[in-house]
């Protein structure tokens, strides 16, 4: 059943898609492995808060402590990187804030660009000085913990020295890693001293360890891969918007609504509305009247824009955005003043939102 | 882990109605659509419509229009589709999916026949 | 409505071999199409969204690009364990529509 009657039947369905809207990432807290992470909901009033990691309720364990409207999460790994949300209920509604978090320290060991540079990690030695094998840069081998996307490249690299000059092999948990281990095998660069896997998938997780040695030693060095998953969500709205506006009568206003999405959201402006002196319908719920909706006729949906207000326009405006997996809503009042209590201009005077660090 | 549990199967008489029922766990019932899908045996998939458990927001393919009905229980995160005025064409395995189309029930064949 | 035609209807390949599978939309459609993998008497399976995006656990030789109206579903290797149907679906606007599905067959 419908939790709202319309006014009136507008057809809400865009006669075909609409162009792709500019969408705008949830804010994003990164830490690195091992490190603790403090997130604050940004949500005021709430009398009760939960938290959602990936859409799945979220509990307190060992590591995860939910205090009043904050989260920690001790000792992060890549495993804690997902989309959270905070959830406040209040007694007359509820409201989520969207973050993501990512406990990563690089997307590919060493460098990042093509291994251009590798050339002077392959040292000559004079051949009278036999030496054993010696690591050359480890400022590369420095991160041990990858949290790489699913899908990405991951380039491992280990530059070694020693004379006579070391041979490399690499294991995977412990064991010989082979090309047939993995579908579309693996690169290994001898003279970067590099293991490179393209387009890795979660099957890649594991510890990735290169041997090092010749006739007068071995050293090794060992690398932990994570591949983080990715899944498609319903439609995230910035924090804080709408914001609460206020003009004047025959004033101007504008609402913005920033949408992340990764299919095609369908944005819709509604704002209660009264019909023969009631706000509910005899069914009790409440008359809505949309606005404004994304499609063919439909300029930037994400704003909507109200021109020579009226004292009847104040109210509460709704920004509903779905998509294919679900929905999300935020909403924001607009208090229309008389002309007399104007202060200072007449056009717009606008709420920014609150962004706290 | 993720589950999405329907209804057993149905063998209707044409004219009447079904109601496939579609019980999901491990997720945020409210948080994400439900869609309903069918396929006749031996043929392709046909979107029938999708819920929005959270406030009841319905979405229909209009082919469908009048003689399907979804509907949802957040107290059990139970989603249902009902259709109506069956006929022997309707014949066909019914399935619900999470709204991200990631996770499927296991499917409810529905029999039309005389 | 969006319509959804997909070619061929059905194919037949040696394991080893690459597939390719295509799907072209009757409208623009951004990236908004997924690809499922569905076996006889089972639930279709979600492979690819959002036209190149490869869902969580699935293997790296399923993949699947294109934007608009023209798009591709490809198998780079081809396995044993992938002769099934799969079918391409828009996610764009309601009424949400799929292919009429290829059915691929082992030589």
């Known amino acids: 059943r419908p939790s709202f009657s319309l006014v009136e039947d507008t057809t809400l369905e865009p006669e075909e898609p609409p162009t792709k809207y500019q969408i705008s990432q949830p804010e994003v807290y990164v830490a690195a492995p091992g490190e603790s992470l403090e997130v604050r909901c940004l949500l005021k009033d709430a009398a009760v808060i939960s938290w959602t990691k990936d859409g799945v309720h979220l509990g307190p364990n060992n590591r995860t402590v939910l205090i009043g409207e904050y989260l920690q999460i001790k000792g992060a790994t890549p495993r804690d990187s997902g989309l959270y949300a905070c959830t406040a209920s209040r007694t007359v509604d509820s409201e989520t804030w969207y973050f993501m978090v990512n406990v990563t320290d690089a997307i590919s060991s060493g460098d990042d660009e093509d291994d251009t540079d590798g050339a002077e990690d392959f040292v000559s030695e004079n051949s009278n000085n036999k030496r054993a094998p010696y690591w050359t840069n480890t400022e590369k081998m420095e991160k041990r913990l990858h949290a790489v996307p699913a899908a990405n490249t991951v380039k491992f690299r280990c530059p070694a020295g020693g004379n006579p000059m070391p041979t490399m092999r690499w294991l995977k948990n412990g064991k010989e890693f082979k090309q047939e281990h993995r579908i579309g095998g693996y690169k290994v660069r001898n003279q970067h001293w590099s293991l490179i896997m393209e387009s890795v998938v979660p099957s890649d997780k594991g510890n990735y360890t290169c041997v090092v040695e010749n006739e007068y030693g071995s050293i090794n060095h060992t690398y932990h891969l994570d591949v983080v998953e990715r899944s498609p969500h319903r439609p995230i709205l910035q924090a804080g918007l709408p914001a609460n506006a206020s003009t004047v009568v025959g004033g101007d206003v504008e609402f913005v609504c920033k949408v992340y999405s990764d299919a095609q959201p369908h944005i819709q402006w509604i704002k209660h509305v009264e019909k023969n002196g009631s706000k509910y319908g005899p069914d009790g719920l409440p008359y809505l009247k949309v606005l404004k909706h994304s499609g063919i006729n439909s300029s930037n949906a994400e704003v909507l824009a109200l021109f020579n207000v009226t004292e009847a326009d104040a109210g509460e405006y709704i920004c509903k955005v779905s998509n294919y997996i679900g929905q999300a809503n935020q909403s924001a009042w607009l208090t229309v003043l008389p002309k007399q209590q104007a202060p200072g201009r007449e056009k717009e005077i606008t709420a920014s939102p609150d962004y706290l660090e | 882990q993720v589950q999405l549990v329907q209804s057993g199967a149905e063998v209707k008489k044409p004219g009447s109605s079904v109601k496939v029922s579609c019980k999901a766990s491990g997720y945020i019932f409210t948080s994400y659509n439900v869609h309903w899908v069918r396929q006749a045996p031996g043929q392709g998939l046909e979107w029938i419509g999708s819920?929005?458990?959270?406030?009841?927001?319905?979405s229909y393919n209009q082919n469908f229009r009048g003689r399907a009905t979804i509907t949802a229980d957040k107290s059990t995160s139970t989603a249902y589709m009902e259709l109506s005025s069956l006929r022997s064409e309707d014949t066909a395995v019914y399935y619900c999916a999470r709204g991200d189309f990631a996770y499927w029930g296991q499917g409810t064949l529905v029999t039309v026949s005389s | 409505d969006i319509q959804m035609t997909q070619s061929p209807s059905s194919l037949s390949a040696s394991v080893g071999d690459r597939v390719t599978i295509t799907c072209k939309a009757s409208?623009?459609?951004?990236?908004?199409i997924a690809w499922y993998q569905q076996k006889p008497g089972k639930a279709p399976k979600l492979l690819i969204y959002?036209?190149?995006y490869r869902y969580s656990g699935v293997p790296s030789r399923f993949s699947g690009s294109g934007s608009g109206t023209d798009f591709t579903f490809t198998i780079s290797s081809l396995q044993p364990e992938d002769i099934a149907t799969y079918y391409c679906q828009q996610h764009s606007t309601t009424p949400y529509t799929f292919g009429q599905g290829t059915k691929l067959e082992i030589k």
């Open positions: 959002s036209a190149s």
């Open positions: 409208n623009g459609i951004s990236n908004d």
């Open positions: 819920i929005y458990p959270d406030n009841g927001d319905t």
